[in-house]
Amino acid sequence: MNGRVDYLVTEEEINLTRGPSGLGFNIVGGTDQQYVSNDSGIYVSRIKENGAAALDGRLQEGDKILSVNGQDLKNLLHQDAVDLFRNAGYAVSLRVQHRLQVQNGPIGHRGEGDPSGIPIFMVLVPVFALTMVAAWAFMRYRQQL
């Protein structure tokens, strides 16, 4: 009995420079090490304090990294993705997908639900508000009769 999980998905370009503690994060995923079911993408698993990513503050654990210096991370073996990061140089540009969970419920495996769907509360709240306004107006109208 899996409930529906809704996500607000945003993309961001993050430019980082390797400091003394490097970019300072770890990754999971790849075609040989799927982190999310039916998704071989590369995800941030850990951000190390004092690394460039932590000091910048925008990259978050759980973010999906879409590209590094313009190079797509689709369909890569895990170690190939790791090597691509390690060979990316001093200045590194990351295209990142943030997924903000906007509704909790009984959930199954992470990644279920429609990531591109409109969060259900964004529909229900206005509908509920409109219903209340209509009911109030109707009651006022009846009182005037």
């Epitope: 490097g22 300072g24 190390k48």
Partner: nanobody, 125 residues
């Protein structure tokens, strides 16, 4: 926390060999990439060798490539550094270090390692 203890250092003549060992405890050894660094008096800490969590990937600087070999035994929670053709300039304190697997930074970034041993002295005469 992970504890690292090095051993195997000593005094050796130029051209000789030594095998350093580093035993890890307190963590899941197979989840860590392992590295060796060295520091000579008055010099900065220098990357010597590294091996990934599975043993399938290694890296060395040009200064030791072909002379030093890093290996690991995950069953024994131990990483080794086989040093052949030793030179006087290899004299230093050798440190074992570990960092969580699948880090995105090159092995030579000392600041990316989470845990360090106390070091073992290697002197080449």
């Amino acid at each position: 926390d992970v504890q690292l203890v090095e051993s195997g250092g000593g005094l050796v003549q130029a051209g000789g060999s030594l095998r350093l060992s580093c035993v890890a405890s307190g963590g899941t050894f197979s989840s860590y990439d392992m590295g060796w660094f060295r520091q000579a008096p008055g010099k900065e800490r220098e990357f010597v060798a590294a091996i990934n969590w599975s043993g399938g990937s290694t890296d060395y600087p040009d200064s030791v490539k072909g002379r030093f070999t890093i290996s690991r035994d995950n069953a024994k929670n131990t990483v080794y550094l086989q040093m052949n053709g030793l030179k006087p300039e290899d004299t230093a304190v050798y440190y074992c270090a570990s960092r969580w697997r699948s880090g995105v930074d090159p092995y030579y970034y000392a600041g990316t390692y989470d845990y360090w041993g106390q070091g073992t002295q290697v002197t080449v005469s």
